[in-house]
Interface confidence: low
């Protein structure tokens, strides 16, 4: 892991998540804005969190305000797919939308 | 449901070792980030590490650097904490925590960053 | 490091009655994606950590809605409307913004 890297997150916008286990990659989370968000089933996905929505919609709390989490642990579970992706954080707001 | 349950824990001596273990249940365990937290006694909350979904990437508060290792057995639904060299300070009740960072949806993701599941705790402590 | 600090440390408050806890961070929380990864967390005696409100202000599944937070940038606010008996135990701010990740020293509330 990533242990003598800069304890921040990178910024949006960058060309590609943060390499885990490249000593030179920042130890933190990845801001939105990089090329691809996690798609479900593809392998080359970073290892995030999969996206919930692809088998049912995430049934939690909040769902008028965008930007919030919806609360875990309701009925949906998150779909999950990406099983064998590279470790780093998810990096929404980019290019190609998540494959459900 | 949803469950962490730690194990692992018990009286050492300075210098000695342990081996945390945390089983999951109730969630697709090979998906989350986690994380170890400890308490030392009638003492705030100390994060002490933290693993990526797949175990790749590892982060270590500066007290246990190089003391302490987190690992992981996705097959297994399992956290691990392997501690060396143990001292006093490292007496607490060490918490197994599951991190959850967000969801995309619709071309959108969404990050939260919070740990919204805690084991019970085991008890490590250290003493001659 | 990124230091949370909590005041006050102790809030003996009256049933019914509204209580308030601070924390304040030694920099900004406000991260690169605009999000501000800071939560609150209740600790009931003899039990683990439990989640209450993330992202300043959202309250997490099953949390009443007598608590409520906010604030920005190194500021924030735990708030209880009116405190219950179950309410009782230690509040903790946390951010996750940046490693490490950090906790305040704790706030205990407890009953007059």
């Known amino acids: 892991g990533v242990t003598s890297a800069p304890d921040t997150r990178p910024a949006p916008g960058s060309t590609a998540p943060p390499a885990h286990g490249v000593t030179s990659a920042p130890d933190t989370r990845p801001a939105p804005g990089s090329t691809a968000p996690p798609a479900h089933g593809v392998t080359s996905a970073p290892d995030t969190r999969p996206a919930p929505g692809s088998t049912a919609p995430p049934a939690h709390g909040v769902t008028s305000a965008p930007d919030t989490r919806p609360a875990p642990g309701s009925t949906a579970p998150p779909a999950h797919g990406v099983t064998s992706a590279p470790d780093t954080r998810p990096a929404p707001g980019s290019t190609a939308p998540p494959a459900h | 449901q949803v469950q962490l349950v730690e194990s692992g824990g018990g009286l050492v001596k300075p210098g000695g070792s342990l081996r945390l273990s945390c089983a999951a249940s109730g969630f697709i365990f090979s998906d989350y980030y986690m994380s170890w937290i400890r308490q030392a006694p009638g003492k705030g909350l100390e994060w002490v590490s933290y693993i990526s979904s797949s175990g790749t990437t590892k982060y270590y508060a500066d007290s246990v650097k190089g003391r302490f290792t987190i690992s992981r057995d996705n097959a297994k639904n399992s956290l691990y904490l392997q501690m060396n060299s143990l001292r006093a300070e490292d007496t607490a009740v060490y918490y197994c925590v599951r991190e959850d960072i967000g969801y995309c949806s619709g071309g959108s993701c969404f990050y939260y960053y919070y740990m919204d599941v805690w084991g019970k705790g085991t008890t490590v402590t250290v003493s001659s | 490091d990124i230091v949370m600090t909590q005041t006050p440390l102790s809030s003996p408050v009256t049933l019914g009655q509204p209580a308030s806890i601070s924390c304040r961070s030694s920099q900004s929380l406000v991260h690169s994606d605009g999000n501000t990864y800071l939560s609150w967390l209740q600790q009931r005696p003899g039990q683990p950590p439990r989640l209450l409100i993330y992202k300043i202000s959202n309250r997490f599944s099953g949390v009443p809605d007598r608590f409520s937070g906010s604030g920005a940038g190194t500021d924030f606010t735990l708030k209880i409307s009116r405190v219950e008996a179950e309410d009782v135990g230690v509040y903790y701010c946390?951010?996750?913004?940046?490693?490490?990740?950090?906790f305040g020293g704790g706030t205990k509330v407890e009953i007059k």
């Open positions: 946390m951010q996750a913004t940046q490693f490490p990740l950090t």
